[in-house]
């Protein structure tokens, strides 16, 4: 109720002679701070004096008097919350009741705590899970209702007296709720741990034995078995007998059923600890074991490999790989069931024995077409020789062989002809499915392996074909040797190297790029007139009249070809100059007179110069000289000079007559 002081602490504390006690304690007084504290041992209330009697272990008063016992007993609390106590060392006669007499200004309280001190260190307690199964991890707990700051202890785990390798986790509690030391050990027991003794040993700080607790492990496990066989090597021949025995070395709980397995499959009606096999066959070869079950599950023995020996069975051949490509490598494997394994092999190709081949595998590093055919083998061991099986077929594939391109036409071939070619070959595996031709062209293939070239070109020099299955084999190219008229006929100036001037020596060459046949004739013409029949056309001294359009022709037995027209240009200085006058050579004064310098020149005149009757240069540079207004004094002879890049030419004199106007005559 509300008139009580509130305390929290463990109900009973445990220790042993010479150890110590640490008493965690909290309180809440009814009013104000604590003024007096007395620790009694086995206090008894005296009704006469209204006080408590008993041994005073500790006393704290206002006058500060402390009994001698205070060194052993310590109050570690305070005046309002903490009431923790320590007794170090603790003695056997400290057992009993501790009374905490608390007084504040107006209130008093007696709080009792039980102390149990034994003569010797008491043992810890081992806690085990309800069931332990092999290989399943469990936690072993060792608990001791003791902990004190002034007296360090340790808990150690032992298995059959030997410290356990697994790491234990130790924890301590010194709280108002509980005081203990605990060690926890995680452990995966094996079936072999069944019945073994586990110890939790209490030791002091120096590792000195204080006390212990022990338990015997009850590890549940499947039956553990041993198998024995006669004969011991488990190797027999067909018709022999074999005995196998199953022995249980351990089972917890007891076993309930027995069975036998071959290659993992249960054998029917075999439920005893002995398996008898009479007159064994090769099919009985395999891995045998016995299986015994209990409530935990089945246990299996190790496997015994029973080998029933027999002569090789008819063989089969495996080919890696068929079909094979010519030039590749191929491996043949002879497969025959036998025990023991065959020691010798005989190989056959198309029924004929292959000399020197006695291994299980035959390796051919480079396959050729003649390697194709049927391969078979015979296996042999100590018990006999097997039969030859049906064999396997090797298919050797290769590109078409001896491919040739054949021209079907009569020779020679002329430009524009239709040419037919065929593509032939000797052998092929697989069969030829298509053909290719080089060079590519817009040509037709009227049938497989035949090419038709319509309007054959002059430059169709060689043709090659390929016959193709999975691969293409190319024939050597064949020359068509097409005959054609001369090509690219053109006129070329040999001399002079620069432009042609009047009077130069000129040579023109009739060039062509090619002709087949090579024998040719030449023809030169100008304006439809035949000039010569040589490859060159020569002019000793060219004149402007030789200028014009020239062509040359080249012909051979196939036809003739003309060049493009070539313009021969002759450069010459201005010539045939003359001065013309407009409106005429007689002009009335005051009017306009225009003098024009006319000429024939190649290139055209670039510069004109005008002169008067005294050969005085007039300041005009155009083809036309305009006098406006013309004067009578301008009457006289005028001439002009024309200049181009070749040279100069001059005109003869032309006379201009300027007459007086009627006005002038009238004034006179």
């Amino acid at each position: 109720d509300s008139s009580k002081w509130v305390f929290e602490h463990p109900e009973t504390l445990y220790a042993w002679e010479g150890a110590c006690v640490w008493i965690p304690c909290t309180y809440r007084a009814l009013d104000g701070d604590l003024e007096s504290f007395i620790l009694f041992h086995n206090p008894e209330y005296n009704k006469n004096t209204s006080k408590f009697d008993g041994t005073r272990l500790y006393e704290s008063t206002k006058d500060g008097k402390v009994p001698s016992e205070q060194k052993r007993v310590q109050f570690l609390g305070d005046k309002n919350k903490n009431c923790t106590l320590s007794i170090h060392p603790v003695h056997l006669n400290d057992s009993g009741q501790l009374g905490l007499r608390m007084e504040s200004k107006t209130e008093k309280w007696m709080e009792r705590i039980h102390l149990n001190v034994s003569e010797r260190p008491f043992p810890p307690h081992i806690q085990l899970p309800p069931e332990i199964q092999e290989s399943q991890e469990v936690t072993l707990t060792c608990l001791l209702n003791f902990s004190c700051y002034g007296y360090p202890i340790q808990l150690q785990w032992l298995l059959e007296g030997v410290p356990m390798r697994q790491a234990a986790v130790t924890s301590t509690s010194l709280t108002i709720k509980s005081v203990f030391t605990r060690s926890e050990l995680k452990f995966s027991p094996q079936w072999s741990h069944h019945g073994k003794i586990v110890t939790c040993q209490l030791q002091d700080a120096d590792g000195k034995f204080l006390s212990n607790d022990t338990v015997q492990l009850n590890v549940k496990h499947t039956p553990k078995l041993e198998i024995k066989v006669t004969p011991s090597d488990a190797i027999v021949r067909e018709g022999d007998s074999v005995t196998m025995t199953c022995e249980v070395s351990s089972s917890n709980p007891e076993y309930t059923t027995v069975s036998w397995l071959k290659d993992g499959t249960s054998l029917k009606k075999q439920n005893t600890f002995t398996l008898n096999l009479r007159e064994v066959t090769k099919d009985q070869s395999g891995k045998y074991c016995c299986q015994v079950s209990n409530d935990v599950g089945p246990g299996r023995s190790e496997e015994v490999f029973l080998q029933v020996q027999y002569a090789p069975e008819p063989s089969t051949v495996q080919i890696l790989h068929s079909p094979a490509v010519e030039g590749s490598q191929v491996e043949f494997l002879c497969m025959s069931l036998a025990n023991p394994l065959p020691t010798n092999y005989t190989w056959y190709h198309n029924g004929k024995e292959m000399q020197g081949r006695t291994e299980e595998k035959v390796h051919i590093p480079k396959i050729l077409p003649w390697h194709a055919g049927t391969y078979s083998c015979v296996a042999e061991n100590i018990l006999g020789t097997g039969q030859r099986g049906p064999g396997a077929e090797l298919d050797v594939q290769y590109p078409p062989k001896k491919v040739t391109t054949v021209i079907q036409n009569p020779m020679p071939i002329r430009e524009g002809d239709t040419v037919t070619l065929s593509c032939n070959y000797n052998s092929s595996n697989p069969s030829v499915t298509r053909y290719e031709w080089k060079p590519h062209g817009a040509w037709e293939e009227p049938s497989l392996g035949v090419l038709k070239i319509q309007n054959v070109g002059w430059d169709n020099t060689t043709i090659a074909c390929a016959a193709c299955n999975s691969w293409c084999s190319w024939a050597s190219p064949v020359a068509l040797n097409v005959q054609y008229a001369p090509r690219d006929v053109r006129v070329r100036k040999i001399k002079p190297l620069s432009e042609i001037h009047s009077g130069n020596s000129v040579s023109l060459q009739c060039d062509f790029s090619s002709s087949h046949p090579k024998e040719v004739q030449f023809f030169w013409e100008k304006n439809g007139r035949l000039l010569g029949k040589e490859s060159q056309l020569n002019f000793d001294s060219i004149s402007p009249e030789d200028a014009g359009s020239y062509s040359c022709w080249v012909n051979n037995s196939i036809g003739q070809t003309a060049s493009k027209a070539w313009t021969l240009e002759v450069l010459y200085a201005p010539r045939r100059l003359r001065v013309s006058m407009s409106p005429g050579d007689q002009v009335m004064e005051g009017k306009s007179a225009t003098l024009t310098c006319e000429s024939d020149a190649n290139p055209p005149v670039s510069h004109y110069t005008w002169f008067d009757w005294n050969n005085q240069s007039l300041p005009y540079h155009s083809q036309k000289l305009r006098l406006e207004p013309v004067k009578v004094q301008h009457s006289g002879a005028y001439w002009c000079q024309g200049t181009n890049s070749v040279g100069k030419g001059r005109s003869p004199l032309s006379t201009l007559t300027v007459y007086y106007s009627p006005e002038t005559i009238g004034r006179r």
């Epitope: 005294n614 300041p619 036309k624 207004p629 004067k631 004094q633 006289g636």
Partner: antibody
Framework: EVQLQQSGPGLVKPSLTLSLTCAIS??????????WTWIRQSPSRGLEWLGR?????????DYAVSVKSRITINPDTSKNQFSLQLNSVTPEDTAVYYC???????????WGQGTLVTVSS | QSALTQPASVSGSPGQSITISCTGT?????????VSWYQQHPGKAPKLMIY???NRPSGVSNRFSGSKSGNTASLTISGLQAEDEADYYC???????????FGTGTKVTVL
């Protein structure tokens, strides 16, 4: 060293005649290797060739099409000078007028100092 | 007869090179090798700088050079100097009755 000295009024009334003279020193107006030219320059028309006079075996004149009907260029051998007369002037004829000598080539190596003529009433 | 076409202005920094073009027709620039160039400072008469397309009169700096291609003539001033700031005119002989034609003029500014 050829020198050209221009003279003439700086102001002419519209419809009247503009008259300028160019006195030559260092050469003869009758030289048979030179021509004597008048050129004008205005902001609106830039440099404009007007005409020339020259002597070879006789005297010749050439005039620009734009002024052909109004222009006269005359030599004065006695004073070794040549003159420009431009009739019926309008404000459009306001410009700086230059006389210049063309030598044996078609270029002007020698120029007068220029005369600003304003046509205004 | 219309004037020859020149750019209105060209500018350059001292030491740089500039080129002024002068475009005409086959009746003037393209037809004759009688192209000349004149320099004119404000208030002064024009001064001959180049004649007959590419010839330099004595006394004119060799920094001035002329050339012609087709119907277009060019004046190049290299190593531009402050005193080169002026108006420049081209001129050509022509086959028309107006025997000479001048360019529109180019103002050269030295930055």
């Amino acid at each position: 060293e050829v020198q050209l000295q221009q003279s003439g009024p700086g102001l002419v009334k519209p419809s009247l005649t503009l008259s300028l003279t160019c006195a030559i020193s260092g050469d003869s107006v009758s030289s048979n290797s030179a021509t004597w030219t008048w050129i004008r320059q205005s902001p609106s028309r830039g440099l404009e060739w007007l005409g020339r006079t020259y002597y070879r075996s006789t005297w010749y004149n050439d005039y620009a099409v734009s002024v052909k009907s109004r222009i006269t260029i005359n030599p004065d051998t006695s004073k070794n000078q040549f003159s420009l007369q431009l009739n019926s002037v309008t404000p459009e004829d306001t410009a700086v007028y230059y006389c210049a000598r063309e030598g044996s080539g078609s270029y002007y190596a020698y120029w007068g100092q220029g005369t600003l003529v304003t046509v205004s009433s | 007869q219309s004037a020859l076409t020149q750019p209105a202005s060209v500018s350059g920094s001292p030491g740089q090179s500039i080129t002024i073009s002068c475009t005409g027709t086959s009746s003037d620039v393209g037809g004759y090798n009688y192209v000349s160039w004149y320099q004119q400072h404000p208030g002064k008469a024009p001064k001959l700088m180049i004649y007959d397309v590419s010839n330099r009169p004595s006394g004119v700096s060799n920094r001035f050079s002329g050339s012609k291609s087709g119907n277009t003539a060019s004046l190049t001033i290299s190593g531009l100097q402050a005193e080169d700031e002026a108006d420049y005119y081209c001129s050509s002989y022509t086959s028309s009755s107006t025997l000479y034609v001048f360019g529109t003029g180019t103002k050269v500014t030295v930055l």
